[in-house]
């Protein structure tokens, strides 16, 4: 019998009954085997087929089989009721071999020309399967040249026999205190050849309840328990199950804590499989009675293991646990059945004994020592030397602790200084000065730093002086020695202040006239006010109308006297402001030269001289009495004049503040 | 050379008072403070208080303000420090010390050679 | 009132030794004023202003610090000045001194 080509050859040719084209002879038998590469099967067609016609292919036919398997028996020319022809048909093998038999009988009526076949190998694609039957793979199938493969759906593994999906159901771990666990796929069918493995662990002192809930269906057998697929529950103390069937199990209390369930499947079966409900129960706690002005948050019928309550205080009332306050307050439910904290006390709150105010008193408006929610306190300042600044100086103590104002701030009030205080209470009859007695001025500010010079302090914490006195100074704020509340150059009992910065004003030019010759001073602490240590008031927008010529302002400083010497004791001179075109008119002849005089600088002292502020009195304050408030304000800042100080026809010039209130303001304001 | 004299050592009993004198040479004696301190044997340095020789302007700790006294007599360039009710916590090296006026004025350039008050019964 | 503490109370050196003695105060101070002090003798200003060489000091001696803490320094001690050295302060009324740090001849 001709054999047909073997893999690994080329899987195709041309089969023909003997003699083709030609007619075939009697007693004929010509048998083919095809053999195609594995995962492969053979394609077979009839390119012409002319065979005698008999009885159920009884004479002459060709056969194709494919292993035991008859695929076809042919005759004829075209199809009848009881014998076929192949037409227009292809035939596959079942398998890699295909087996063609062609036999022709001892007569023929009439000449016939046979058969001509063409084959081929190929790929066999057992992904695709008939209605009906199995399919080759439980989840995915993925066909390729010469064979096929297997995959699984996430949360499944291809098990070993290469074809079904065993669920990756193992390892699952439930902690919470309730909760819901079922077979895969639930309620869907339940893979096969599976093991899954679920813990639930809870923490000791909780026990598992579990309820099989919904449906109950694990592939069973009648006479057999749970031969094939089973659920089966542990526990440390025992073993439940195994369960299958179609009957939901009855509720398992546990009393453990930890439960393991493992369900087992086989190979076979097509079940819904099951699902647990489980809670969990414990020793319940004592029912927690709320504190007096307090309350319990959230209420519940009981509170077991791990069931917590919190505590709040009424409005005014804040949680203590013995005499410690607590931010927030929640109790949680032991094992034990004991709660894990005492209950602590709604006490009322309390803002404390209030802070001192700076410069000022405060006194209790409740009762003495009264500091609990709701207790009024009235802060004031030291009389005489300061003042409350836009606060009444009543706080209240608010639900938060703090104390706090009527407009809500939990700051203090400000004490500010009240300025412009002097011992002399008008002006009056240096250089030809008389000696200045304590509280006269008590804005007078020494300043060393390689000269002397003079200041008037600001507020308590600023110093106002001409830019030429500190200039040196500027980028070593540190090394001005500012000393105040003394009336005596060389007394070591004064008020030592240090500056933080020194700001000159930027329209100051140094050895190029004296416009803008203006500085600030910021004191690296507060100085404490009192009647040696008062600060000056800056003028008002109505300041002019005490500044006009002939008007009485005076000059302090420990500068020269007329005898040469800085003076020992501080000393002060009135003298009137002079008219401004006549002081201009007195700078415009040499040495000085035209235009010495500016809009930003005032003049004062007599034309017949004797009086005027001298070297030393530099940035010393020209002060005169606003007669309306009875307050002094600085009008002037010693700034130049003559080179010898009193002469006649020559003023004292000093830098007019008014015209630098903005640039004063701003840099307070700023720094 | 600029000098601080004080007078020799006394011995008082307890409630009596003791005047101690320093007298100044060398330099412009209303131009300086002059300051009081006191040692007890074998402690430290205490300061007492001070005073202006120019207008006999004073200054003293509170623990000596009722029972201190610093005066002047200009024309002998001295200095006096009296202290009365003595107890025998008294007992100690007085001293008179001139007050810098270069700098601060805050610490002291010259001092006396220091006049030792015994108070016993 | 500001309290200053020497460190150490007393101290054991030789001749040609570095010493160093601290002045500790309880609230900041801008200047210290230094003094030595022999048995039977008046104090004698040896810094003023912190770091200022007082007139007929040797320049072995030194001074530094600032806020609460200052120094003396002896860089090469010399026989003379075995003796007592008290730091003083009056940025803060009143002035008060330090208990002294006496300096023995080891």
């Known amino acids: 019998t001709p054999l047909g080509p073997k893999w690994p050859e080329p899987v195709f040719g041309r089969l023909a009954s003997p003699g083709f084209p030609g007619e075939y002879a009697n007693d004929q038998e010509r048998r083919w085997t095809l053999t195609a590469p594995p995962g492969y099967r053979l394609r077979l067609y009839f390119t012409h087929f002319d065979l005698e016609l008999s009885h159920l292919c009884e004479y002459d036919f060709v056969k194709l089989s494919s292993g035991a398997k008859v695929l076809a028996t042919l005759c004829g020319q075209e199809s009848t009721d009881t014998e076929r022809a192949p037409g227009k048909d292809t035939f596959y093998s079942l398998g890699s071999s295909l087996d063609i038999t062609f036999r022709s009988d001892y007569s023929n009526e009439k000449p016939f020309t046979g058969f001509e076949a063409f084959y081929a190998a190929e790929d066999i694609d057992e992904c695709q399967v008939a209605p009906g039957e199995a399919p080759t793979c439980d989840h995915h199938c993925h066909n390729h040249l010469g064979g096929f493969y297997c995959s699984c759906r996430a949360g499944y593994v291809l098990h070993r026999n290469k074809r079904t999906c065993s669920a990756l159901c193992s390892g699952q771990v439930f902690t919470q205190r309730s909760g819901e666990l079922s077979s895969p796929e639930y309620p869907r069918p339940y893979p096969k050849l599976s093991s899954c493995t679920y813990s639930i662990s809870l923490e000791e002192g909780f026990s598992v309840i579990l309820d099989f809930v919904e449906s109950f269906d694990v592939e069973t057998h009648p006479e057999t328990l749970c031969p094939y697929d089973f659920l089966k529950i542990q526990t440390d103390r025992e073993e439940h199950g195994p369960f299958c069937g179609k009957t939901l199990p009855h509720r398992i209390e546990t009393k453990s804590n930890t439960v393991t369930i493992t369900f087992v499947t086989d190979e076979s079966g097509d079940h819904t499989g099951w699902k647990i409900h489980y809670t969990s129960t414990a020793q319940p706690c004592p029912y927690p009675m709320a504190p007096p002005n307090g309350h319990v948050s959230p209420v519940q019928a009981k509170y077991i293991l791990k069931d917590s309550f919190s505590i709040f205080c009424e409005t005014g009332y804040e949680l203590l646990q013995g005499h410690l306050p607590l931010k927030s307050f929640t109790a949680v439910c032991q094992k034990d059945g004991s709660w894990d904290r005492p209950m602590p006390a709604c006490s009322i709150v309390d803002c404390g004994p209030p802070d001192d105010l700076p410069s000022g008193r405060v006194e209790y408006i409740t009762g003495p020592g009264v500091t609990t929610y709701k207790a009024v306190i009235q802060y004031s300042c030291e009389e005489t030397f300061y003042t409350m600044k836009v606060n009444d100086g009543k706080y209240v103590c608010e639900a938060d602790g703090f104390w706090t104002s009527s407009k809500g701030e939990k700051s203090l009030p400000v004490c500010e200084p009240v300025c412009g205080l002097s011992a002399r209470t008008t002006g009056g009859r240096i250089y030809g000065g008389q000696k200045a007695k304590p509280g006269d001025f008590p804005w007078q500010v020494l300043i060393l730093g390689g000269t002397t010079a003079a200041g008037a302090l600001l507020y308590d914490n600023w110093v106002l002086t001409a830019a030429h006195a500190v200039y040196e100074q500027k980028h070593d704020a540190s090394a001005l020695d500012i000393r105040m509340g003394t009336l005596k150059r060389l007394s070591p009992h004064y008020t030592q202040a240090w500056s933080e910065a020194v700001f000159i004003h930027e329209g100051y030019t140094h050895d190029a006239g004296f416009d803008n010759d203006i500085a600030l001073i910021k004191l690296n602490n507060k100085v404490v006010i009192n009647s040696n240590i008062t600060p000056i008031c800056l003028p008002r927008k109505e300041a002019e109308s005490f500044m006009r010529t002939d008007d009485i302002g005076t000059a302090s400083g420990w500068g020269l006297t007329q005898r040469g010497f800085l003076a020992r004791n501080l000393m002060y001179v009135d003298i009137p402001i002079v008219d401004h075109q006549k002081c201009t008119a007195a700078y415009e002849k040499p040495p000085y030269p035209r235009g010495s005089v500016t809009a930003n600088m005032l003049c004062a002292g007599l034309e017949s001289g004797g009086k005027d502020s001298c070297r030393g009195d530099s940035g010393g304050a020209l002060v005169f009495l606003d007669s309306e408030t009875e307050r002094w304000f600085v009008g002037g800042i010693v700034s130049w004049g003559s080179m010898n100080c009193g002469e006649a026809g020559q003023y004292g010039v000093y830098t007019k503040v008014i015209n630098y209130i903005p640039w004063i303001e701003n840099i307070i304001s700023d720094f | 050379q600029v000098q601080l004299v004080q007078s020799g050592a006394e011995v008082k009993k307890p409630g009596a008072s003791v005047k101690v004198s320093c007298k100044a040479s060398g330099y412009t004696f209303t131009n300086y403070w002059m300051h009081w301190l006191r040692q007890a044997p074998g402690q430290g340095l205490e300061w007492i208080g001070d005073?202006?020789?120019?207008?006999?302007?004073?200054h003293y700790i509170e623990k000596f303000k009722d029972r201190a006294t610093l005066t002047i007599d200009k024309s002998s360039s001295t200095a006096y420090m009296e202290l009365s009710s003595l107890r025998s916590e008294d007992t100690a090296v007085y001293y008179c010390?001139?007050?810098?006026?270069?700098?601060?004025?805050?610490?002291?350039?010259?001092w006396g050679q220091g006049t030792l008050v015994t108070v016993s019964s | 009132d500001i309290q200053l503490t020497q460190s150490p109370s007393s101290l054991s050196a030789s001749v040609g030794d570095r010493v160093t003695i601290t002045c500790s105060a309880s609230s900041s101070v801008r200047y210290m004023y230094w003094y030595q002090q022999k048995p039977g003798k008046a104090p004698k200003l040896l810094i003023y202003?912190?770091?200022n060489l007082a007139s007929g000091v040797p320049s072995r001696f030194s001074g530094s610090g600032s806020g609460t803490d200052n120094t003396l320094t002896i860089s090469s001690l010399q026989p003379e000045d075995f003796a007592t050295y008290y730091c003083q302060q009056w940025s803060s009324y009143p002035l008060t001194f330090g208990q002294g740090t006496k300096v023995e001849i080891k």
């Open positions: 005073i202006d020789p120019s207008d006999s302007e004073t």
């Open positions: 010390a001139r007050g810098d006026i270069t700098t601060t004025l805050r610490y002291f350039d010259v």
């Open positions: 202003d912190t770091s």
